[in-house]
């Protein structure tokens, strides 16, 4: 069966029907490049006016305008708010009332696209494997990133969160139109990784999405992540304004000027320092969501009532922090280089600015306890990675899981740890799962490109797709069309249950209280330390003044991860697509 032309609020669209075998039978309808909104520079998105005739939705549209990896040029375009749909079809009748999974990509709120990295037309975020294996509809889309998506003056003149509003427009479009493609508009799951995972979290917290989202999955990121909210957007807006020659004293005049500035100039006015700086790299990412009093009306920690009826899966990779550790402490990955106590202390103090000297010392002490018994370089390097993983991913995710569970009415809560080791040959032998390593398995790459993977990789991918799509169907990762290797029990506040995802998932993979000692340290010991104000404004700009100076944080909550690798059109597959 195949859909043919589908009528949407914008008009008719026609995709392509791809047979899954030469013998006919099952197939997938694929629609690429359906417009879901339009947007002017630094303005909220608006409904697309539509078209006449039948739109041929057969090619991915360009990504939203963003800097290239070298940060000396741009690619993509401003006209970028398009979405893509994969609809699995059986032999006879066209599908109807299927669960819908809407993907939000990561990229530090700075880069990325709905189709993901591409190698020889093999796109990372190709929804075909998830759709056909899980019998769900998959939707991916573009949203604005970087200054064009998140620049804010912190007031009504440039409220920011344009990229988040783009995401909302896509979700709302799906709600209004997906029935025509055979989807169930009352069963929408949003899922994403890193900045996409934090976006998923923010969308569930925003009052704008009331009634739109049934379930959510956050992979390595949360609204509570210290890199997910910018607390001092005006500083960064002024930095950009100065670079492009706009006035900075009056936010109204600054906003008016920025809106008529060449968008490419705005994009290139911000440069991310990727060489080691005085502070952790995540401090230097400026253009991220803000608490605007509207779309995000309050600090995310105060918005969990809004998730009371949204089922949630949240988890991290066991070495999510590795990517950032390699930038902050480059010796981590170099066998011939050593990590020193001083290196680690500098990293710790950079992440604990808000609590000053006492915070840095207490944190350093607990993380280096094992160094007395085992002062090996391997242990010290693993500590650096564990610390970055905890601060940037684990602790915010654990707090969010507890908040979700505590506020749940009908909602169910599930937690996981992805531990299937990275396949990067250049990594140390002790390496676990790096940031973004989970993506290739969720999107079924071991099946789509089997020659590049081992049977154990296919086992991981099969299990993840089964759990993810069962959850989208029923709100329970164990119940649905796909058999799973073991029962995944819900998260409880008492036991902190989580599923450890490895190549062999058994009943022993259900574990409890992940890194409990460190969670208690951050939630209790560190939390009660007095916040200091004196030495927080000492962040110095990068040496090259073409790179944007970091914002003096008013607390330690505005750090954001940084991409060391490109997710550009020609990135190798499988690629590490960060954040």
């Amino acid at each position: 069966a195949k859909l043919g032309a589908v009528y949407t609020e914008g008009g008719f669209v026609e995709g392509v029907n791809k047979k899954l075998s030469l013998l006919g039978g099952d197939s997938v309808d694929i629609f690429k490049g359906i417009p879901f909104a339009t947007a002017k520079t630094l303005e909220n998105p608006q409904r697309h006016p539509g078209w006449q005739g039948t739109l041929k939705a057969t090619n991915f549209k360009k990504r939203c305008l963003q800097a290239t990896i070298t940060q000396d040029n741009t690619y993509g375009q401003e006209d970028c708010l398009y979405l893509n749909i994969w609809v699995p079809q059986g032999r006879k009748q066209v599908s109807h009332n299927l669960p819908v999974m809407v993907w939000i990509y990561g990229g530090a709120f700075l880069m990325g696209s709905g189709q993901g990295a591409n190698f020889l037309k093999n796109y990372l975020y190709d929804g075909e494997e998830i759709a056909t294996r899980g019998n769900v509809i998959v939707v991916t889309f573009n949203y604005r990133v970087g200054p064009l998506g998140f620049l804010s003056t912190g007031d009504a003149n440039l409220p920011g969160n344009f990229g988040l509003r783009d995401q909302h427009m896509a979700i709302a479009w799906v709600k209004r139109n997906i029935a025509a493609f055979g989807g169930d508009p009352d069963n929408i799951t949003i899922f994403g990784e890193s900045a996409g995972a934090a976006s998923v979290s923010l969308q569930t917290l925003s009052p704008y999405n009331k009634g739109l989202i049934r379930r959510a999955i956050s992979q390595s990121g949360m609204a509570l992540s210290p890199w997910a909210i910018q607390k001092n957007p005006l500083f960064w807006a002024k930095t950009i304004a100065k670079k492009v020659g706009c006035p900075t004293e009056d936010t109204g005049k600054m906003a008016a000027c920025l809106k008529i500035t060449d968008p490419r100039a705005l994009t290139l006015a911000y440069k991310l320092p990727v060489k080691k700086q005085e502070y952790p790299v995540v401090h230097y990412l400026a253009f991220i969501p803000v608490i605007d009093g509207d779309f995000i009306p309050d600090d995310p920690i105060n918005l969990y009532n809004n998730t009371a009826d949204i089922d949630y899966i949240a988890g991290i990779n066991n070495m999510d922090g590795h990517l950032f550790a390699t930038i902050d402490v480059p010796a981590v990955d170099k066998t011939k280089q050593t990590v020193t106590e001083e290196d680690f202390y500098r990293l710790v103090s950079g992440h604990t600015v808000a609590k000053g000297l006492k915070g840095a010392q207490a944190t350093f002490d607990i993380y280096t306890e094992s160094w007395a018994q085992d002062p090996s370089q391997e242990n010290m390097k693993k500590t650096v990675v564990a610390f970055e993983t905890d601060v940037l991913f684990l602790i915010p995710t654990e707090i969010a899981l507890a908040q979700h569970k505590a506020h749940a009415k009908s909602a169910k809560t599930y937690s996981y740890l992805f531990s299937h080791p990275s396949r990067m040959p250049i990594y140390p032998k002790w390496m676990g799962a790096d940031h973004a390593d989970d993506l290739q398995y969720v999107f079924g790459k071991p099946f789509a490109t089997p020659l590049g993977y081992r049977p154990q990789d296919r086992a991981v991918s099969k299990a993840m797709i089964a759990y993810w799509t069962n959850f989208a169907r029923s709100g329970d990762p164990n119940m649905g069309n796909s058999p799973v290797p073991t029962h995944w029990y819900p998260y409880t506040l008492e036991n902190g249950n989580y599923l450890d995802i490895t190549k062999t998932i058994t009943s022993a993979s259900m574990k409890e209280h992940l890194r409990e000692k460190f969670l208690k340290f951050w939630a209790v010991t560190f939390e009660v330390l007095p916040t200091v104000t004196g030495d927080q404004d000492t962040l110095t700009p990068p040496e090259d003044d073409s790179e944007v100076a970091p914002d003096p944080p008013s607390d330690d909550s505005q750090v954001v991860p940084v991409p060391p690798t490109d997710d550009s059109v020609e990135a190798q597959m499988p690629a590490t697509i960060g954040f």
Partner: antibody
Framework: QVQLVQSGAEVKKPGASVKVSCKAS????????MHWVRQAPGQGLEWMGV????????SYTQKFQGRVTMTRDTSTSTVYMELSSLRSEDTAVYYC????????????WGQGTLVTVSS | DIQMTQSPSSLSASVGDRVTITCRAS?????MNWYQQKPGKAPKLLIY???SLPSGVPSRFSGSGSGTDFTLTISSLQPEDFATYYC????????FGQGTKLEIK
């Protein structure tokens, strides 16, 4: 100017079919979608479906799926709506209506065709 | 399907009055359209995209709203304005409100 002229009133028996025509003029026929909307006596408006006269693509609301067929004849700039297995509750005025612009509201309407279903 | 709730279902007013008709959508929608229909006639487009007036529609008609709540306002009723008014949302399956009959008081 845009004009949509519909065929005349029809009286049908239950179980029969009816085919209503809508002839368009004053614009490029294949450039705008044509919708069909019906209104039962003393009732509100009900959208039935839409046809793209350019390629003949159609979409029908769930309620009429399997009973309604919309076609077009580009040589005469006419669209047709056929409703089968008529029942008494199908008694209504049937309107064709053209998009105003883009995917927009229904900006131009035919005069309506009364279809009466009675035994 | 998107549900449309129009209120009031009927309304009595006098020439010169200011009249407001509301339409609530569930879930939220992007844009709302409004139509006027007189007895025995086809509907006529009055407001599109929540607040835009097609050419030929008098400026006493205005529309506002976003998300779930939309309003049609007639600033000063004229004799020819007594009719039935319908709101309509545009999704993959467009739906109309049940109508508001505006009568002379």
């Amino acid at each position: 100017q845009v004009q949509l002229v519909q065929s005349g009133a029809e009286v049908k028996k239950p179980g029969a079919s009816v085919k209503v025509s809508c002839k368009a003029s004053g614009y490029t026929f294949t450039s705008y979608n044509m919708h069909w909307v019906r209104q039962a006596p003393g009732q509100g408006l009900e959208w039935m479906g839409v046809i793209n006269p350019g390629d003949g693509a159609t979409s029908y609301t769930q309620k009429f799926q399997g009973r309604v067929t919309m076609t077009r004849d580009t040589s005469t700039s006419t669209v047709y709506m056929e409703l089968s297995s008529l029942r008494s509750e199908d008694t209504a005025v049937y309107y064709c209506a053209r998009d105003y612009y883009g995917s927009s509201p229904l900006g131009y309407w035919g005069q309506g065709t009364l279809v009466t279903v009675s035994s | 399907d998107i549900q449309m709730t129009q209120s009031p279902s009927s309304l009595s007013a006098s020439v010169g009055d200011r009249v407001t008709i509301t339409c609530r959508a569930s879930p939220s929608i992007s844009y709302m359209n409004w139509y006027q229909q007189k007895p025995g006639k086809a509907p006529k487009l009055l407001i599109y995209a929540a607040s835009s007036l097609p050419s030929g529609v008098p400026s006493r008609f205005s529309g506002s709203g976003s998300g779930t709540d939309f309003t049609l306002t007639i600033s000063s009723l004229q004799p020819e304005d007594f009719a039935t008014y319908y709101c309509q949302q545009r999704s993959s399956s467009p739906t109309f409100g049940q109508g508001t009959k505006l009568e002379i008081k």
